[in-house]
Interface confidence: medium
């Protein structure tokens, strides 16, 4: 399908002008290629009428032009002094007329209505309000005032000053007679319907002395605003319906093939399941305006959207509406990224978030979509490192891999973490994307002890076990903080051939803190990655305590919680049986070692891979 998009139907009146805007993907080639407006003939050929290269056909000379806006990916065709002969089928396009990079536009030019002299013309959108002004002479001031609608040769009474109201206008019309001295009465019609369209007659008094004034009321369906967005991107519909409906329920609906309108979302809590997790109805302002954001755009989201107000939260005739025609461009600049990421309870996920690569300095955010209250998205983390309290130690936003993608890591997963999350920046809002996290059955691949208590001044060693499938990955330990996860210095991870063969003695990466200081308290992550692409992580909290007074019964210098069976050894080293480990098949025994002896040289914090003293067993 062609990525060029424009208005399907354009209608106007003889003598008037039209402005036709066509959209195209703003690639470098497209921005500079020829743009054209041509008319389709009976033969199927399309004859150029105006182009961006300066050509204007004789028929269009002096009344048409084409302007390209390459920075927006749009071009505009203006045609003036329209005649009925301009009605027909046209194409706006790029390149060569026959190439197919075009959009079909139907132009209909109708004859203007023949109106009686002195007729006042009122042009109002459907659902809005019109005030018809009716002047009269002093002698008719005390006499009956009325408004009639002309239907063919007859006049039908709509409203008069004797309290008559035509049933078709019930509860939406009023006649106002001013105080003395003002020789004008007004008729106000609210919530205009298409059927209200037509010629009206104001009358004051009767007989030959009566005052009359003609009014032509043109009720228009709102011209849909064309919206051109990229596949996988985001769209915002800003809906401003006016103060008169500020306190009425609002909705966004999509027109279906039967020309009815299916509610997408409304302020009464209704939401189309097709938009679950990727829509927000932003709370309305006091002037009644609101906006709807849809992310993760799909081709099937294309179509005509209406926003409106009605107490039922759905489209009703005679209530104000706004319209959009959404086109989803499949030649998207937004890269594909997983829309569903799966993790296991206790495990982790690494989510890749795209952003506009031209905006590398923009702030990045991640928020959790909430379905309540028309959809809300509280921010959980942002690129300056700030993390919401309840996510401390288990959530980090990393600028890597960069160049249009950032990474969000969430670990210590629980079933509560399942849901939809949005990737955001404070830059180009069209790059908002949605990812769903699903929690599935299984065990985490990385195994670390539970929370660990370390003793000031001593050595702490924390093991992290990984399965064979991660043997080719880079392993790391990092210390989590609000500003990210600072990688700790890494030591040689053992002979490379051991990793290649997945030697069972090489499936452990250990963190050593020597000596332990107060500043070491906090969250540590063990993780795997390939280049700048992050894989699984596991988190452990290290608490730091003072050394106990000599002679007292021993308290482990490096104590891991949730170890049901432990032997207290005279050497001051506590052994944790495999019951503390989530997958006993992965390794038989784990030691959290507090080494009271001095270590010669070496870094204070180090990561090292060594034997896990496995008794066999295989990883999943």
């Amino acid at each position: 399908k062609s990525p060029v998009f424009g208005p399907q139907e354009v209608s106007s009146v003889e003598g008037n002008s039209v402005s036709i805007k066509c959209y195209y993907p703003p690639t470098s080639v497209n921005r500079h290629t020829r743009k054209y407006w041509c008319r389709k003939g009976a033969s199927g050929r399309c004859i150029t009428l105006v182009s961006s290269e300066g050509y204007v056909s004789s028929n269009y000379a002096g009344r048409a032009n084409l302007t390209n806006f390459p920075e927006n990916g749009t071009f505009v065709v203006n045609i003036a002094q329209l005649s009925r002969d301009d009605s027909g089928h046209y194409k706006c396009g790029l390149g060569i007329n026959s190439r197919g990079l075009s959009f079909d536009v139907s132009l209909e030019v109708s004859q203007g209505p023949e109106l009686p002299n002195g007729t006042e013309v009122y042009t109002v959108d459907v659902g809005r309000t019109v005030t018809i002004k009716c002047p009269f002479k002093t002698e008719n001031a005390p006499k009956t005032k009325a408004l009639y609608k002309k239907i063919g040769q007859t006049s039908v009474l709509v409203i008069d000053s004797r309290n008559y109201v035509n049933p078709n206008y019930k509860d939406r019309i009023r006649l106002r007679i001013p105080g003395t001295g003002q020789l004008i009465f007004t008729v106000v019609i609210d919530r205009l319907r298409l059927s209200d369209h037509g010629l009206y007659l104001c009358q004051a008094g009767d007989g030959s002395n009566r005052d009359e004034k003609n009014a032509d009321l043109q009720v228009l369906e709102p011209e849909p605003e064309l919206v051109y967005e990229d596949l996988r991107g985001s769209v915002t519909f800003h809906c401003a319906l006016g103060l008169e409906v500020a306190n009425v329920a609002k909705f966004l609906c999509r027109v279906n093939s039967r020309e009815t309108c299916d509610v997408v979302i409304n302020t009464l809590g209704k939401r189309d399941s097709a938009f679950e997790g990727r829509i927000l109805l932003n709370p309305q302002d006091k002037d009644g305006s609101f906006s709807v954001v849809i992310t993760g755009l799909r081709k099937e989201d294309e179509g005509r959207y209406l926003c409106g107000a009605h107490s039922d939260g759905q489209l009703q005739e005679g209530w104000p509406i706004q319209a959009w025609q959404l086109f989803v461009n499949e030649e998207s600049t937004i890269p594909r990224s997983p829309t569903v990421v799966k993790g296991v309870a206790g495990g982790s996920v690494a989510v890749l978030c795209p952003y506009n690569p031209k905006e590398s300095q923009s702030l990045k955010y991640w928020c959790l979509w909430e379905g309540a209250q028309n959809g809300r998205c509280p921010l959980l983390v942002e690129s300056q490192g700030l993390v919401q309290e309840q996510y401390e130690g288990r959530l980090s936003l990393l600028q890597e891999p960069g160049n249009g993608t950032f990474t969000v890591i969430l670990n210590q997963l629980t079933t509560q973490d399942a849901g939809f999350y949005w990737c955001l920046t404070n830059g180009d809002t069209r790059w908002r994307t949605t990812v769903e996290i699903k929690i599935i059955e299984g065990e985490p691949n990385l195994k670390v002890p539970g929370n660990v208590t370390a003793v000031l001044g001593e050595t702490l060693n924390i093991p992290c076990h990984f399965p064979c499938k991660f043997s080719s990955y880079e392993k790391y330990w990092c210390k989590w903080s609000n500003t990210g996860c600072q990688t700790l210095p890494s030591q040689d991870e053992g002979p490379s051939e051991a990793f290649v063969n997945c030697d069972e003695n090489s499936r452990l990466v250990s963190l050593t803190l020597n000596p332990v200081t107060r500043a070491d308290e906090g969250w540590y992550w063990c993780g795997v990655k390939q280049g700048h692409f992050y894989g699984e992580t596991a988190a452990v909290y290290v608490a730091v305590e003072e050394k106990k007074v000599a002679g007292s019964r021993y308290v482990s210098p490096a104590k891991a919680d949730a170890a049901p069976d432990e032997k207290v050894l005279d050497s001051g080293v506590r052994e944790i049986e495999n019951k503390a480990i989530q997958d006993p098949r992965l390794f038989a025994e784990e030691k959290v070692v507090a080494d009271t002896g001095d270590q010669a040289g070496g870094s204070r914090a180090s990561v090292d891979s060594s034997s896990s003293e496995e008794q066999g067993g295989s990883s999943k």
Epitope: P283, F290, C367, L379, E382, L386, N426
Partner: nanobody, 124 residues
């Protein structure tokens, strides 16, 4: 949590100007959107202005449009409200509030963090 401290209030004559400041400390992610609200004696607290983190999206109450300007300095974690052409009806306690909700329009209910307020009195 985030702490918000307002300053800059005071007594000013009608037609005069004041600049209010709101300094945030702590978990400033909760000031992704920062707003100013005001409460006059015996009246409900009402929205005055709001600004998002980037400063690119601002919104004002009709009663202050063209007179008040909201801005922010992220390096200082501070949001400002410049109030010009002050009127007696602007007299109120002005509160700064923060929200972590990503939203095009943020209403009163979306603000979870509030300051203690600063008194602004405009005499005629």
């Amino acid at each position: 949590e985030v702490q918000l401290v307002e300053s800059g209030g005071g007594l000013v004559q009608a037609g005069g100007s004041l600049r209010l400041s709101c300094a945030a400390s702590g978990r400033t992610i909760n000031t992704y959107v920062t707003g100013w609200f005001r409460q006059a004696p015996g009246k409900e607290r009402e929205f005055v202005a709001r600004i998002d983190w980037s400063g690119s999206s601002t919104d004002y109450a009709d009663s202050v449009k063209g007179r008040f300007t909201i801005s922010r300095d992220n390096a200082k974690n501070t949001v400002y409200l410049q109030m010009n052409s002050l009127k007696p009806e602007d007299t109120a306690v002005y509160y700064c509030a923060g929200s972590a909700y990503y939203s095009g329009y943020v209403t009163h209910r979306d603000f979870g963090s509030w300051g203690q307020g600063t008194q602004v009195t405009v005499s005629s």
